[in-house]
């Protein structure tokens, strides 16, 4: 099949890093500077991504692969392939329309990126709060008070594994 296809379509012989040049009798021409083709048989080369401004070059563009960007210090990537850079906040904060704001009571963020998330509800697992939560840290759950009462067995069966039941915000 491949051989038949290549007889019918000379472009299928053009490897990655080249394009099938219609202006030159469908000869395989190298991709021009600042462009690439990551697969064979391409009729055009794609323009290389340029990492400008708050973006930093993580990997240079080559004739067969696009450039890859990350973010300058104080910023972090968002989305696939670092589509955007967003400013960092401190732990215990999240970025809002008005800049970095402290997490509301009952929520935390232990990173410089992302959003404030609700503290774990220990009682859903039949446990009690061992260490209170803060803006920067989730609560730590411990055995329920009943487990600690006199006469209670010191060996308690492990709580069933539970998927976090969060819904998108």
């Amino acid at each position: 099949f491949e051989r038949t296809r290549s007889l019918q379509d000379p472009c299928s012989n053009c490897p990655a890093g080249t394009f099938c040049d219609n202006n030159r009798n469908q000869i395989c021409s190298p991709c021009p500077p600042n462009s690439f083709s990551s697969a064979g048989g391409q009729r055009t080369c794609d323009i290389c991504r340029q990492c400008k401004g708050v973006f930093r070059t993580r990997k240079e563009c080559s004739s067969t692969s696009n450039a890859e960007c990350d973010c300058t210090p104080g910023f972090h990537c968002l989305g696939a392939g670092c589509s955007m850079c967003e400013q960092d906040c401190k732990q215990g904060q999240e970025l809002t329309k008005k800049g970095c704001k402290d997490c509301c009571f009952g929520t935390f963020n232990d990173q410089k990126r992302g959003i404030c998330r609700p503290w774990t509800n220990c009682s859903l697992d039949g446990k009690s709060v061992l260490v209170n939560g803060t803006k920067e840290r989730d609560v730590v759950c411990g055995p329920s008070p009943a487990d600690l009462s006199p006469g209670a067995s010191s060996v308690t069966p492990p709580a069933p594994a539970r998927e976090p039941g969060h819904s998108p915000q």
């Epitope: 968002l78 696939a80 970025l95 329309k97 992302g114 998330r117 998108p168 915000q169």
Partner: nanobody
Framework: QVQLVESGGGLVQPGGSLRLSCAAS??????MFWYRQAPGKQREYVAH???????NYADSVTGRFTISRDNNKNTLYLQMNSLRAEDTAVYYC???????????WGQGTLVTVSS
């Protein structure tokens, strides 16, 4: 288990409008995105919206497309107006988790702009 399910794609004439939806479930999402991939082209960023309503758009769609999200319904939208032939693509919904460390993807919905 995270699920992102797009809908609303279809055939529309140049100058027309479409509204895409993406129903999300299974996690807290800090940021939700629309990307698109035209035939034979690289996937490209279209727009994003954060959980607290900050938005951003690619230059090619600014002023024509509007991204929004309904946090109660866990749904992301893309209102596309003044559509052009070059907007023809498969449109993908994507979402970053609460810590911006993982990106989840929908299966895509095809938008064709043609007379």
């Amino acid at each position: 288990q995270v699920q992102l399910v797009e809908s609303g794609g279809g055939l529309v004439q140049p100058g027309g409008s479409l509204r895409l939806s993406c129903a999300a479930s299974g996690d807290i999402f800090s940021i939700m995105f629309w990307y698109r991939q035209a035939p034979g082209k690289q996937r490209e960023y279209v727009a994003h919206i954060t959980s607290n309503g900050r938005t951003n758009y690619a230059d090619s769609v600014t002023g024509r497309f509007t991204i929004s999200r309904d946090n109660n319904k866990n749904t992301l939208y893309l209102q596309m107006n003044s559509l052009r032939a070059e907007d023809t693509a498969v449109y993908y919904c994507a979402a970053d988790d609460a810590t911006n460390t993982r990106t989840y993807w929908g299966q895509g919905t095809l938008v064709t702009v043609s007379s």
